[in-house]
């Protein structure tokens, strides 16, 4: 025998209290598929979250983050504070990248400068907190008298790989 609830479309639920009649989802709830016995509560975008898409009877609300924050996790489950380029987020907030690392975005973590010597190249432009090093031709390719830029040795930081 066919389940009468299977006839209930999205945006409704199969109301057991009313002889399995298809009733519309109450305000602030939705059902995104047919045949549902209950409607789901709409997500509310509060605090650092802001509404990107309003809830409807057939689809949940979608949130993004207020300015100064960015989304993290599936469906923007968290809002994380933006930092400036050259910084990364820690427990205490935004901190400058350690020597030998950089971040060219407002989010994410500081990453080490590229190790140019891995490809047999030299450092053409030094790295900064905001930018990676630029690798140039291999030292052997440099014309006589030319020299590559060597970054200063870090002071008391853990050993960064040689450039």
């Amino acid at each position: 025998l066919q389940d009468p609830c299977s006839n209930c479309p999205a945006g409704t639920f199969c109301d057991n209290n009313r002889n399995q009649i298809c009733s519309p989802c109450p305000p602030n709830s939705f059902s995104s598929a047919g045949g549902q016995r209950t409607c789901d509560i709409c997500r509310q975008c509060k605090g650092v979250f802001r509404t990107r898409k309003e809830c409807s009877s057939t689809s949940n609300a979608e949130c993004d983050c207020t300015p100064g924050f960015h989304c993290l996790g599936a469906g923007c489950s968290m809002c994380e504070q933006d930092c400036k380029q050259g910084q990364e987020l820690t427990k205490k907030g935004c901190k400058d990248c350690c020597f030998g690392t950089f971040n060219d975005q407002k989010r994410g973590i500081c990453r080490p400068w590229t190790n140019c010597s891995l490809d047999g190249k030299s450092v053409l432009v030094n790295g900064t907190k905001e930018r990676d090093v630029v690798c140039g031709p291999s030292p052997a390719d440099l014309s006589p008298g030319a020299s590559s830029v060597t970054p200063p040795a870090p002071a008391r930081e853990p050993g960064h790989s040689p450039q």
Epitope: L72, T90, K91, K95, I109, R111, N115, L118, E157
Partner: antibody, heavy 121, light 112 residues
Framework: EVQLVQSGAEVKKPGSSVKVSCKAS????????IYWVRQAPGQGLEWIGN????????FYGEKFMGRATFTADTSTSTAYMELSSLRSEDTAVYYC??????????????WGQGTLVTVSS | NVMLTQPHSVSESPGKTVTISCKLN????????VHWYQQRPGSSPTTMIY?????PDGVPDRFSGSIDSSSNSASLTISGLKTEDEADYYC??????????FGGGTKLTVLG
């Protein structure tokens, strides 16, 4: 499913080198730090260093500078740790671990199963 | 050098509550997150608490983490102790964001 699978146990002679591999799967290998940590028998966890596979950039703990070398092969999503001039005190289980990109002081969310390196004459 | 100091061992009976401390010798315990790992014999560490007080999915709510700035230390508390909680526990924080620091580890024995 994120996984870090390490190479098998090794027995080495003092003065020789060992190379341990850590094959990553289930995530974008180039977008997360891989840390190397070791644990001597009956001892605690000790940081060796870390690599950013995206560009091969590395950091080494002071104790391991000049002896440890980290590399990463992005084509196979495998990180390597080579330790040279081995001595008996290097006998330990060596772990690779992944750090999320949420913050600069985050935890290690996935660990390899560990590789036992025994240094004995 | 930054160090995290843990008691070498703690023991308690099943059903009781135990707290493992992790004291920072210099700097401010509030500067960087503290994380806690459980390690059973022959196994890799697994995360029990991350970012001071958060529990990963699958970790029972009997495990909780806290920070006490007055004593410059972090704590892992396990309530309703079970025999399966017997393991080594390690705290983990940072000296700088590229230099992780681990506590020496605490062996938890569940009596009985």
């Amino acid at each position: 499913e994120v996984q870090l699978v390490q190479s098998g146990a090794e027995v080495k002679k003092p003065g020789s080198s060992v190379k341990v591999s850590c094959k990553a799967s289930g995530y974008t290998f180039t977008s997360y730090y891989i840390y190397w940590v070791r644990q001597a028998p009956g001892q605690g966890l000790e940081w060796i260093g870390n690599i950013w596979p995206g560009n091969g950039g590395t950091f080494y703990g002071e104790k391991f500078m000049g002896r440890a070398t980290f590399t990463a092969d992005t084509s196979t999503s495998t990180a390597y740790m080579e330790l040279s001039s081995l001595r008996s005190e290097d006998t330990a289980v060596y772990y690779c671990a992944r750090r999320p990109d949420y913050s600069g002081d985050d935890y290690f969310d996935y660990w390899g199963q560990g590789t036992l390196v025994t240094v004995s004459s | 050098n930054v160090m995290l100091t843990q008691p070498h061992s703690v023991s308690e009976s099943p059903g009781k509550t135990v707290t493992i401390s992790c004291k920072l010798n210099s700097g401010n315990i509030g500067s960087y997150y503290v994380h806690w790992y459980q390690q059973r014999p022959g196994s890799s560490p697994t995360t029990m608490i991350y970012r001071d007080d958060k529990r990963p999915d699958g970790v029972p709510d009997r495990f909780s983490g806290s920070i006490d700035s007055s004593s410059n230390s972090a704590s892992l508390t396990i309530s309703g102790l079970k025999t399966e909680d017997e393991a080594d526990y390690y705290c983990h924080s940072y000296d700088s964001t590229i230099t992780p620091v681990f506590g020496g580890g605490t062996k938890l024995t569940v009596l009985g």
